[in-house]
């Protein structure tokens, strides 16, 4: 993400964006898209991105959608370097124990976890 | 995961395993693993997966510790299980929109997103 | 009210360089994008390009690149339109419009006559 | 590039016929935009979407269409109709025109 917008101000003009173009983008009824079932949000952002592509290639252009397409893309490069991040850093077994338990913590507090 | 096993007590009890072990655990002190580097745990769960079969393949078995290992890969199927269901379900634009931006939404408010 | 107020008529000699504006009131330019299109006496309509106000982003037609430049000033809320090298094949009319979420809104036009 | 052939060039129709002018892609595209133009106007945005009328547009006027083959249609010609009708894809750059369907009116 080029240093001059911060990722949280992109996050915020994308979502403005996408609230204004929303009637455009549905304009395309026949259309179907992979939408996950649950709401574990970062567990799927592959298959949200490939979506965004779909979108895409579906939606007229030389409108401000574009600037969407384009926040979008920033977006997954953003978010491509942080999967980057997961496994950059060797660590002392106690750091790495501090990193699961805050993870299956988080799990426990914030996922959403359908009953069985 | 076994339907008698709820996600979300598998995941208190790992929790409750993992301080249990915790001074065994850390007995290598010359062991190093991929820490990731930022809190979108939801990013790494491949690379806290890799970490733990590397913890798992250099820690003394038996007891509960194996508990521990066989909890954790539950929750690492489990995980598996809401990956397959991100792309499972194809729907129309509008239900992804309402995803993308809860998405980005979730993003916006949850995510620990650094500052540039 | 949205309006774009395109320059006046303007009579240039062969090879010289012209420049058009088309000012905006009722809206910002920075929120949409800004296309400019030529027409030839008695013929159609041909896409020359379009910028993104909010960071200069251009797009030409391939037959227009080299030949015009677009431009736009934030702070006057007005494009530009800069030809070169003018021929008799320039003479044209010539178009503003703004294309938001659609290309609602024209400006009036500018003739643009080449001729010794 | 798309290249859109419209047709047919010229028409006339009398006030209250049907009319309906096609709008041809070299390739497939999503939607087609049309536009009206009148002598010594403008052009005004008609139809967005191959079929949403652009705001003040008459009910009598219609669009229809997809991938290759579009088509404008008005149900009972007015005299006001009467105009040169210009068809666009926004797919893929450069985004281009048709070359216009003049309807006069008889």
């Known amino acids: 993400i080029p240093t001059e917008i911060p990722a949280s101000a992109l996050v915020k003009e994308t979502l403005a964006l996408l609230s204004t173009h929303r009637t455009l983008l549905i304009a395309n009824e026949t259309l179907r898209i992979p939408v996950p079932v649950h709401k574990n949000h970062q567990l799927c952002t592959e298959e949200i991105f490939q979506g965004i592509g779909t979108l895409e290639s579906q939606t007229v252009q030389g409108g401000t959608v574009e600037r969407l397409f384009k926040n979008l893309s920033l977006i997954k490069k953003y978010i491509g370097g942080q999967k980057k991040k997961c496994g950059e850093e060797r660590r002392r077994v106690n750091q790495f124990l501090d990193y699961l338990q805050e993870f299956l913590g988080v799990m426990n507090t914030e996922w959403i976890i359908e009953s069985h | 995961i076994p339907t008698e096993i709820p996600a979300s007590a598998l995941v208190k009890e790992t929790l409750a395993l993992l301080s249990t072990h915790r001074t065994l655990l850390i007995a290598n002190e010359t062991l190093r693993i991929p820490v990731p580097v930022h809190k979108n745990h939801q990013l790494c769960t491949e690379e806290i997966f890799q970490g733990i079969g590397t913890l798992e393949s250099q820690t003394v078995q038996g007891g509960t510790v194996e508990r521990l290992f066989k909890n954790l890969s539950l929750i690492k199927k489990y995980i598996g299980g809401q990956k397959k269901k991100c792309g499972e379900e194809r729907r129309r634009v509008n239900q992804f929109l309402d995803y993308l931006q809860e998405f980005l939404g979730v993003m916006n408010t949850e995510w620990i997103i650094e500052s540039h | 009210e949205v309006q774009l107020q395109q320059s006046l008529a303007e009579l240039v000699r062969p090879g010289a360089s012209v420049t058009l504006s088309c000012t905006a009131s009722?809206?910002?330019?920075?929120?949409?994008?800004i296309h400019w299109v030529k027409q030839r006496p008695e013929q159609g309509l041909e896409w020359i390009g379009r910028?993104?106000?909010?960071?200069?982003?251009?797009k030409h037609g391939p037959k227009f690149q080299g030949k015009a430049t677009i431009t736009a000033d934030t702070s006057s809320n007005t494009a530009y339109l800069q030809f070169s090298s003018l021929t008799s094949e320039d003479t044209a009319i010539y178009y503003c419009f703004r294309y938001g979420i659609y290309p609602d809104h024209w400006g009036q036009g500018t003739p643009l006559t080449v001729s010794s | 590039q798309i290249v859109l052939t419209q047709s047919p060039a010229l028409m006339s129709a009398s006030p209250g016929e049907k009319v309906t002018m096609t709008c041809s892609a070299s390739s497939s595209v999503n939607y087609i935009y049309w536009y009206q133009q009148k002598p010594r106007s403008s052009p005004k945005p008609w139809i967005y979407l191959t079929a949403t009328l652009a705001s003040g547009v008459p009910a009598r006027f219609s669009g229809s269409g997809s991938g290759t083959s579009f088509s404008l249609t008005i149900s009972r010609m007015e005299a006001e109709d009467a105009a040169t009708y210009y068809c666009q894809q926004w797919n893929s750059y450069p985004y281009t025109f048709g070359g216009g369907t003049k309807l006069e009116i008889e």
């Open positions: 910028i993104d106000p909010a960071n200069g982003d251009t």
């Open positions: 009722g809206f910002n330019i920075k929120n949409t994008y």
